[in-house]
């Protein structure tokens, strides 16, 4: 009973600096209560970007502080990453593990390259 | 750097309770599973149980379920075992472990806390 | 239950030489969700590898790991002196997280 997760391979983020993408999973058991994690791998380091625990049925929910936002449909998330920059350019993985009830199922995407350019400062311009 | 220290082992008689902490300290507690591993003399590893995150979800093995309780405090960095009905076959050391990054395996472990029941 | 089977139970080698341990689950381990600890009398277990085959930090590289689905492998290129330990299997695709009995590799 593995647990299958799939993400896009690549995301470009918007001049704004906002990228979104599914994390869709297969779950073998009927869970009540998903745990949602985007981890940012680069140059070896990994670093954790946003959790979101939430119950089926209900939207996700970030910490106010979080630079993620997302909402949820059976067993696919919609992530959105905001405030991006180009150094935030890297693999952004999406971890999904069945929290509730027993037993518990880990699942890890393969990842999406997100693609992060800083927009060019517009020009002055003399009138 | 990471550490976690257990304490609460000792000698009791079997039905009897027993109590295990684990400080943590090196690390944001609250993002990680935490859990309890255990090893009977001479023998190989146990996992006993986990409480993930925020403290809601807990996971038991089948030997412990319905006598053994873990709980945390994010607030002291304090994981907890609370273990009731204790029998022989719980004699042990009891370890705290840090569920890894990327899933529930332990990258880091306490030094352990021998339990032994015993009338 | 994912029942985990560790092979040989011991392994005599000399420093120096190569070390092949095997584990082997009941079914699959969904994946790659398989870690490897070295445990040396009295102290705590150590993380070797994590996802079958990623070395865990500050794990020296005659470390490898291999495998998928159900067989697995746990190789030591050369063995030093400090290597003399005993190993354990785990997976952790899905609860119960449950360990192999062990391989205990020592000096011949």
């Known amino acids: 009973k593995a647990m299958h997760v799939a993400q896009p391979a690549v995301v470009l983020a918007s001049s704004r600096g906002i990228a979104s993408f599914v994390c869709e999973y297969a779950s073998p058991g009927k869970a009540t209560e998903v745990r949602v994690t985007v981890l940012r791998q680069a140059d070896s380091q990994v670093t954790e970007v946003c959790a979101a625990t939430y119950m089926m049925g209900n939207e996700l929910t970030f910490l106010d502080d979080s630079i993620c936002t997302g909402t949820s449909s059976g067993n696919q998330v919609n992530l959105t990453i905001q405030g991006l920059r180009a150094m935030d350019t890297g693999l952004y993985i999406c971890k999904v593990e069945l929290m509730y009830p027993p037993p518990y199922y880990l699942g890890i995407g393969n990842g999406t390259q997100i693609y992060v350019i800083d927009p060019e400062p517009c020009p002055d311009s003399d009138f | 750097q990471v550490q976690l220290v257990e304490s609460g082992g000792g000698v009791v008689q079997p039905g009897r309770s027993l109590r295990l902490s684990c400080i943590a300290s090196?690390?944001?507690?609250?993002?990680?599973?935490m859990h309890w591993v255990r090893q009977a003399p001479g023998k190989g590893l146990e996992w006993v149980a986990v409480?993930?995150?925020?403290?809601?979800?807990?996971h038991y093995a089948d030997s412990v379920k319905g006598r053994f309780t873990i709980s945390r405090d994010n607030s002291k960095n304090t994981l907890y075992l609370q273990m009731n009905s204790l029998r022989a076959e719980d004699t042990a050391v009891y370890y705290c472990?840090?569920?890894?990054?990327?899933?529930?395996?332990?990258?880091?472990w306490g030094q352990g806390t021998l339990v032994t029941v015993s009338s | 239950e994912i029942v985990l089977t560790q092979s040989p139970g011991t392994l005599s080698l000399s420093p120096g030489e190569r070390a092949t341990l095997s584990c082997r689950a009941s079914?699959?381990?969904?994946?790659?969700?398989l870690a490897w600890y070295q445990q040396k009398p009295g102290q705590a277990p150590r993380l070797l590898i994590y996802?079958?085959?990623s070395r865990a930090t500050g794990i020296p590289d005659r470390f490898s790991g291999s495998g998928s689905g159900t067989d697995f492998t746990l190789t030591i290129s050369r063995l030093e002196p400090e290597d003399f330990a005993v190993y354990y299997c785990?997976?952790?695709?899905?609860?119960?997280?449950?360990f192999g009995p062990g391989t205990k590799v020592d000096i011949k």
């Open positions: 472990a840090r569920g890894g990054v990327w899933g529930p395996y332990f990258d880091y």
């Open positions: 090196g690390f944001t507690f609250s993002s990680y599973g």
């Open positions: 409480n993930w995150y925020d403290g809601s979800n807990k």
């Open positions: 079914q699959s381990v969904s994946s790659s969700y």
């Open positions: 996802g079958a085959s």
């Open positions: 785990q997976q952790y695709g899905s609860s119960p997280f449950t």
